[in-house]
Interface confidence: low
C-alpha cells in the first residue's frame, strides 16, 4: 500500500507535467501560427515594396527620357531662335566659324558644307576689317572660299562670283600653276595665293538667322 | 501487486508521453528561433526596400523639378532673341569675346566690365576644353580672370571664388612677387602666372541671354 501510494503520487506528478507540457505545446502552436501569419504579412509587404520600387524605376526612366528629349529640344530651339549656332561668331548678317582642325582646301570646303555653310566670302572692306580683327591674334593661315584653276583664269568665290579687285591684293604664288588649283588664304590680315592641296585652318560662313524671334 | 504493476505501466506510459512532449517542445523551440531569424531577415529586407523606395522618390522628385525647369526654360528660349551680342561666341550658358587689343590685366578687366562682362572664368574641364580649342590657332597669351596678391595668397577668380586645384596647373612665375600682383594667362592651352602689369590679349565672358525677352 505504501508502494502503491508512492506510485500514485509519481503518476499525479507525471500527469501534471504532461498537462503542463501539452499547454506549452498548444501556446507554442498558437505563437507559431501567429508568427507564420506575421511572416506572410511581411512577405506581402516585401512584394508590395518591390512592386512599388519597380514602378518608381519605370517612372524614373520615363522622366529621364523626357528630360533628355527636353534637353535636345532646348538645344534645337535655342539654335533656331539664335542668329547663329553655338561656337559661331555672329557679325552683321553672317555667322562665322573658325575651324580648329587643319585640312586642304577641298576638305575644308566639305567641312563647311556639312555645317550648312561655305568657306569665307569677303564682300566689303567692313567684312575684311572684321576678319582681320578676328584673326589678329593668330599667326596661322586660314583658307577662304576663293580659288582659280590656273593663272589664266579669274579668281572666283564658291558661288561663282568674281573677286572685286578693289577689296584686297593677292600676294604670294599668284603666277604659279598647281595641279589642284590655286586657293586663297588669309594670314595676319593679308591674302595669299597657295597650292590648294596644302593644309591650313579655315573660316566657315553662313547667313545669320535674323527672322523675327 | 497487480495494482502496483498497473501503476508502473501507466507511469512508464506517462514518462514516455512526457519525453515525447519535451522533444516536441525542443523541436518547436528551434523552429521558433529559425522563424524569428527569418522574420528579422524579412524586416531587414523591408527596411532596405523602403530606403531604396525613398531614395528613388527623392531622385524622381528631383527629375520632376528638372523637367519643370527645362519646360520653363524651353518656353523662355522659344521666344528669346540672340543669346550673345555680335562678335561674341556663344557656348553653352556663356558668351565669350576674344579681345583684339593687347592691355595689362587691370585694363583688360576694365574693358570687359565696360561690356557688362568679366574676364574668363574656367569652372570645368569642359570649359577648359572649349577655350583651348578656341585659341588653338593662336600663339599669343590671353589674360583670364584669375589673380593673387602675392605667392602666400590663394589664386582667386574675380568673383572671389578660389581656383579648384584639379582644373589645371599654373606654370611660370608662380613664386614671384610683383607690385601689381600676379595674374594668370592662358597660352596654347597651358596656364601661366605673370606680372599683371604686362600687356596681353584677353577673353571676356558673360552669361548668355537665355531669359524671356
Amino acid at each position: 500500500s505504501q508502494v502503491s501510494n508512492l506510485l500514485k503520487q509519481q503518476q499525479t506528478n507525471l500527469t501534471h507535467q504532461k498537462n503542463k507540457l501539452e499547454g506549452q505545446i498548444s501556446a507554442r502552436q498558437q505563437a507559431e501560427e501567429a508568427s507564420q501569419e506575421s511572416q506572410n504579412e511581411l512577405k506581402e509587404m516585401i512584394e508590395t515594396l518591390a512592386w512599388k520600387l519597380n514602378e518608381k524605376s519605370k517612372e524614373q526612366m520615363e522622366l529621364h527620357h523626357q528630360n533628355l528629349n527636353l534637353q535636345e529640344t532646348l538645344k534645337r530651339v535655342a539654335n533656331c531662335s539664335a542668329p547663329c549656332p553655338q561656337d559661331w561668331i555672329w557679325h552683321e548678317e553672317n555667322c562665322y566659324l573658325f575651324s580648329t582642325g587643319s585640312f586642304n582646301w577641298e576638305k575644308s570646303q566639305e567641312k563647311c558644307l556639312s555645317l550648312d555653310a561655305k568657306l569665307l566670302k569677303i564682300n566689303s572692306t567692313a567684312d575684311l576689317d572684321f576678319i582681320q580683327q578676328a584673326i589678329s591674334y593668330s599667326s596661322f593661315p586660314f583658307w577662304m572660299g576663293l580659288s582659280r584653276r590656273n593663272p589664266s583664269y579669274p579668281w572666283l568665290w564658291e558661288d561663282g562670283s568674281p573677286l572685286m579687285p578693289h577689296l584686297f591684293r593677292i600676294r604670294g604664288a599668284v603666277s604659279q600653276t598647281y595641279p589642284s588649283g590655286t586657293c586663297a588664304y588669309i594670314q595676319r590680315g593679308a591674302v595669299y595665293a597657295e597650292n590648294c592641296i596644302l593644309a591650313a585652318f579655315s573660316i566657315c560662313q553662313k547667313k545669320a538667322n535674323l527672322r523675327a524671334q | 501487486s497487480q495494482v502496483s504493476n498497473l501503476l508502473k505501466q501507466q507511469q512508464t506510459n506517462l514518462t514516455h508521453q512526457k519525453n515525447k512532449l519535451e522533444g516536441q517542445i525542443s523541436a518547436r523551440q528551434q523552429a521558433e528561433e529559425a522563424s524569428q531569424e527569418s522574420q528579422n531577415e524579412l524586416k531587414e529586407m523591408i527596411e532596405t526596400l523602403a530606403w531604396k523606395l525613398n531614395e528613388k522618390s527623392k531622385e524622381q522628385m528631383e527629375l520632376h523639378h528638372q523637367n519643370l525647369n527645362l519646360q520653363e526654360t524651353l518656353k523662355r528660349v522659344a521666344n528669346c532673341s540672340a543669346p550673345c551680342p555680335q562678335d561674341w561666341i556663344w557656348h553653352e550658358e556663356n558668351c565669350y569675346l576674344f579681345s583684339t587689343g593687347s592691355f595689362n590685366w587691370e585694363k583688360s578687366q576694365e574693358k570687359c566690365l565696360s561690356l557688362d562682362a568679366k574676364l574668363l572664368k574656367i569652372n570645368s574641364t569642359a570649359d577648359l576644353d572649349f577655350i583651348q580649342q578656341a585659341i588653338s590657332y593662336s600663339s599669343f597669351p590671353f589674360w583670364m580672370g584669375l589673380s593673387r596678391r602675392n605667392p602666400s595668397y590663394p589664386w582667386l577668380w574675380e568673383d572671389g571664388s578660389p581656383l579648384m586645384p584639379h582644373l589645371f596647373r599654373i606654370r611660370g612665375a608662380v613664386s614671384q612677387t610683383y607690385p601689381s600682383g600676379t595674374c594668370a594667362y592662358i597660352q596654347r592651352g597651358a596656364v601661366y602666372a605673370e606680372n599683371c602689369i604686362l600687356a596681353a590679349f584677353s577673353i571676356c565672358q558673360k552669361k548668355a541671354n537665355l531669359r524671356a525677352q
Epitope: 587643319s102 585640312f103 596661322f140 | 588653338s136 611660370g172
Partner: antibody, heavy 115, light 107 residues
C-alpha cells in the same frame, strides 16, 4: 624629361632636297607647336616657321615659303622639315625647338650644300 | 617685321664683374621678350622669358629688365661658365625675330 632628338648632319648637292627630322620625347607632342630656326655666321638665328602637330596647321616666314615644308607625324611624335632646291645659302645649322618662348631645343642638324 | 638690335657684338668683362647686355626692338613688344645663352657647338638655352622671368635652373646672378622697346640682360659676379653668346628674341608677333647676339669674353 623633355628632349628633342634631331637627325644627323647632311652633305647635299645644289638643287637637291633634304628632309630633317626632330623626335619629341617626354611630353605630349600634339600639345605644343614645333618651331624651326636656322643659324648661320652671317645672319645669326632666323625663325623659319612653326607647325601645330595637333592640327597640322603651319606658319612660315615669307622668306622660307616654298623653301621649307613643315610636317608632323603624330604616330611617331616626330616633326619634319623638308628643304628644297638647295643652294649654298641654305648651308646652316637647323634647330627644332618647342613653342614660345623656345624652352627646349634639339641639338641641331648641320646641312652643307656643296658640289 | 620687328627688328631686334643688340648694340654690342662683343663685350669683355673681368671675372666677378657685372655685365649689362642691351636689346632694342623696333616696335613695342609688350615684354614678350626672351634671352638665350649659346655656348660654342651647343644649341641655345632659354634663360629668361617675359623679359624678367628666370627659367628653372638658371642661376640667380642672371636677371632681366625693361619694357616697351628697351630690354636688358644683367649678369652679376661673372663666372667662367658664363662665357657665351647671348641672344634676345621677341615673340609677340611673327616672324619671331632674334637680335644679332652679344659675345661675352673674359678680360
Amino acid at each position: 624629361q623633355v628632349q628633342l632628338q634631331q637627325s644627323g648632319a647632311e652633305l647635299v648637292r645644289p638643287g637637291a632636297s633634304v628632309k630633317l627630322s626632330c623626335k619629341a620625347l617626354g611630353y605630349t607632342f600634339t600639345d605644343y607647336e614645333m618651331h624651326w630656326v636656322k643659324q648661320t655666321p652671317v645672319h645669326g638665328l632666323e625663325w623659319i616657321g612653326a607647325i601645330h602637330p595637333g592640327s597640322g596647321g603651319a606658319a612660315y616666314i615669307q622668306k622660307f615659303k616654298g623653301k621649307a615644308t613643315l610636317t608632323a607625324d603624330k604616330s611617331s611624335s616626330t616633326a619634319h622639315m623638308e628643304l628644297s632646291s638647295l643652294t649654298s645659302e641654305d648651308s646652316a645649322v637647323y634647330y627644332c625647338t618647342r613653342w614660345l618662348p623656345m624652352d627646349y631645343w634639339g641639338q641641331g642638324t648641320s646641312v652643307t650644300v656643296s658640289s | 617685321d620687328i627688328q631686334m638690335t643688340q648694340s654690342s657684338s662683343y663685350l669683355s668683362v673681368s671675372l666677378g664683374g657685372r655685365v649689362t647686355i642691351t636689346c632694342k626692338a623696333s616696335d613695342h613688344i609688350n615684354n614678350w621678350l626672351a634671352w638665350y645663352q649659346q655656348k660654342p657647338g651647343n644649341a641655345p638655352r632659354l634663360l629668361i622669358s617675359g623679359a624678367t622671368s628666370l627659367e628653372t635652373g638658371v642661376p640667380s646672378r642672371f636677371s632681366g629688365s625693361g619694357s616697351g622697346k628697351d630690354y636688358t640682360l644683367s649678369i652679376t659676379g661673372l663666372q667662367t661658365e658664363d662665357v657665351a653668346t647671348y641672344y634676345c628674341q621677341q615673340y609677340l608677333i611673327t616672324p619671331y625675330t632674334f637680335g644679332g647676339g652679344t659675345k661675352l669674353e673674359i678680360k
